[in-house]
């Protein structure tokens, strides 16, 4: 059998291999050692017994899409049946105190490979033997601790294969410089050690994509915006656009990246080298946002110009044809740069919203029949922008972290946007008050610290930022400026 007979449904063409030469990979026309690595078709009854206690699942993931020329990394993780795990020696053991259908196991081992490998007859003293080889006969690499690696992974794509000895998780990186653009298929077959041979335990496949477009994502955020994912934002407040470039192999690390923005509101083009930009829309409506990212990245060198055509020679003496009969143009081993582009387009809607909220006055309310532990305080609030439809107050500890009470209620506010919010405080002390005004599209927040005095008639009201004062005194509460923080990870700058 050949590798393509074992690993794929169809024999890949030589054309596919020639057009996608992967460094360090081998042609799937090579012979497969079926004696050492038996081949079972899908549905073969032997799969049922390929693993003690159930089936092993292989999960294949990649960091696709990959910009052509960059590395793409594939990770295979083996998921064992319930209660099974790989130990430090590479043996498969039952987890302690874990109960599966078979109950608790007396034997701690599912597979004790250490014991098997110590029985090392047939080896020639170097640790090399006829069974420590891959399906194509190549010997296992003798890394430190290689004996604890009991799984053989065979990766197959584009008519080529790559063999790897590993534990329950392996990763393989492939350079995509010679890979045809578009979606491709990666298939992985996993074998486990079984005495002096191997047994297939899992097969998995996944599509990956190679592209010449920089994969670009943009996050959009705005203070007071109620829902950042609906692409509806508020007029007269800056929107922060943050560009994330998917470049897990850091291919573009040394590239100069330019960001060209068109916000769709006739403000022209804005070119920046910063991945973050702020823009304020001053009109309501729907706008088409366009971003072009440009990076000078390592790329193929253009072929040298062809020599001038020679006049036909009278003698038909052809030179040796063996070297390069197909004229496969060589790509010089130079560091050429090529401009790569990425694009992002979004339609965003701009609406009125609550732009700002301020507490302008805080008043202790005199109660005719004071409760033993209760104080009422009125907050006089103003806002700018659209008219709020609800108000929420969150009362918490002085650090503003532990919520003690949260109340939301509808409000009916006139055009002046002046309202009084009355809230009860249980007991004396310092409180953090978060006050939020909201409508359909926006939420505006302000915070203040307030000090509620003892109800002891002898004591006077204490404020957060002042000395004493009478019960009816009006005081300015200490303001806490509040900003929503967005944390992003970037590969660049």
């Amino acid at each position: 059998k050949r590798f393509h007979d074992v690993l794929g449904n169809e024999r890949p063409s030589a054309y596919m291999r020639e057009h996608n030469q992967l460094n360090g990979w081998s042609s799937d026309e090579n012979d497969w050692n079926e004696k050492l690595y038996p081949v079972w078709k899908r549905g073969d009854m032997r799969w049922k017994n390929s693993w003690k206690g159930g089936r092993v699942q292989a999960v294949l993931t990649s960091d696709s899409p990959a910009l052509v020329g960059s590395n793409i990394t594939f990770v295979v993780n083996l998921v064992f049946p319930r209660c099974q795990k790989e130990d430090a020696n590479g043996n498969i053991v039952y987890e302690k105190n874990c109960r599966n259908e078979a109950g608790l196991s007396a034997d701690p081992y599912v597979y004790n490979w250490t014991a098997w490998s110590e029985d090392s007859d047939g080896e020639n003293g170097t640790g090399q033997s006829h069974h420590n080889v891959f399906p194509d006969g190549k010997p296992f690499p003798h890394h430190p601790g290689w004996r604890r690696w009991n799984f053989v992974y065979v990766f197959h794509t584009l008519g080529q294969y790559f063999q790897k000895l590993g534990r329950c998780s392996v990763r393989v990186s492939v350079n995509t410089a010679n890979v045809t653009l578009g979606p491709q298929l990666m298939e992985v077959t996993v074998y486990r050690r079984h005495g002096r041979a191997y047994v297939p335990i899992a097969q998995v496949k996944d599509v990956y994509v190679v592209t010449d477009q920089i994969p670009v994502f943009v996050t959009m955020s705005q203070k007071n915006d109620r829902n950042s994912s609906d692409e509806t934002f508020l007029k007269d407040l800056p929107i922060t656009f943050d560009v994330l470039i998917h470049d897990p192999s850091h291919f573009l690390n040394y590239s100069t990246i330019n960001y060209k923005w068109s916000f769709g509101d006739n403000t022209g083009l804005f070119v920046s080298i910063n991945h973050t930009v702020n823009h304020t829309y001053v009109l309501n409506g729907t706008f088409s946002l366009n971003l072009t990212v440009k990076a000078a990245a390592p790329g193929p060198c253009p072929p040298p110009p062809p020599p001038p055509p020679r006049p036909p020679k009278p003698t038909p003496s052809l030179g040796p044809a063996g070297d390069n009969p197909l004229g496969l143009s060589e790509i010089p081993d130079e560091n050429c740069q090529i401009n790569r582009y990425g694009h992002f387009q979004a339609t965003i809607t701009i609406v009125e919203g609550i732009l700002e909220v301020n507490i302008i006055q805080t008043t202790d309310v005199l109660m005719l029949v004071p409760g033993p532990d209760s104080s009422l305080i009125d907050f006089v609030v103003t806002c700018q922008g659209s008219i709020p439809t609800e108000v929420c107050t969150i009362i918490s500890d002085p650090t503003c972290e532990i919520t003690q009470n949260a109340v939301c209620s509808p409000v009916d506010v006139d055009e002046m946007c002046l309202l009084t919010v009355r809230r009860a405080f249980n007991g004396s002390g310092t409180y953090c008050v978060n006050l939020t005004l909201g409508d359909d599209t926006s939420l505006a927040l302000t915070s203040t610290l307030i000090s509620v005095p003892d109800r002891d008639p002898a004591s006077s009201l204490r404020m957060a930022n002042s000395g004493g004062g009478g019960l009816n005194d009006i005081f300015e509460a200490q303001k806490i400026e509040w900003h929503e923080h967005h944390h992003h990870h970037h590969h660049h700058h």
Epitope: R11, A14, Y15, H19, V68, T180, G182, P303, I331
Partner: antibody, heavy 119, light 107 residues
Framework: QVQLVQSGAEVKKPGASVKVSCKAS????????MHWVRQAPGQGLEWMGE????????NYAQKFQGRVTMTVDKSTSTVYMELSSLRSEDTAVYYC????????????WGQGTLVTVSS | DIVMTQSPDSLAVSLGERATINCKTS??????LAWYQQKPGQPPKLLIY???YRYTGVPDRFSGSGSGTDFTLTISSLQAEDVAVYYC?????????FGGGTKVEIK
Amino acid sequence: QVQLVQSGAEVKKPGASVKVSCKASGYTFTSYWMHWVRQAPGQGLEWMGEINPYDQRTNYAQKFQGRVTMTVDKSTSTVYMELSSLRSEDTAVYYCARSTGNYAWFAYWGQGTLVTVSS
Amino acid sequence: DIVMTQSPDSLAVSLGERATINCKTSQDVSPSLAWYQQKPGQPPKLLIYSGSYRYTGVPDRFSGSGSGTDFTLTISSLQAEDVAVYYCQQHYSIPLTFGGGTKVEIK
């Protein structure tokens, strides 16, 4: 939809060169190899070579090696095939054809360009 | 180079009857073989790729079969519009090569 539009018919003298263009639209130009296939009057199809618009790698059939040059203009999504030292047996319809991913079968063809070599 | 031998050179079949065209390759190209239909003054049109896969929009009276070095294109019930020249092409390796063509006519 995918379209390959070729340049018009040419009449050339023996020994001259001809440059045929093939303008692609309706797909990502750099993602697919472009091939050239010719057909002499009343004869079968003959593959001449291919070019990758992304990196301008080329493969030419041995028969045309040294006489054919395939080039790309990415800005206009156009592929060119230049054949030099023309002789009468080069009289043919020249087609550009787009391969599909890693498979060299041709679902999309240009309309063809007749090149006549005559003294 | 892989040599493609197509047979017969021409074929006359009654309307509604079966037409069979063969293509033999000088080495194993399985399953990388395509079939095309060409009418006068037009570029070829892809019918079958990878031996047996019918291309989008191709009527199901066209089918491809075979493996290794022997392949067949079958038109199960010949229609008037099927009159054309049919070519096989190996897409296994470069240089890509075509068969000499089979002319299908109505008897």
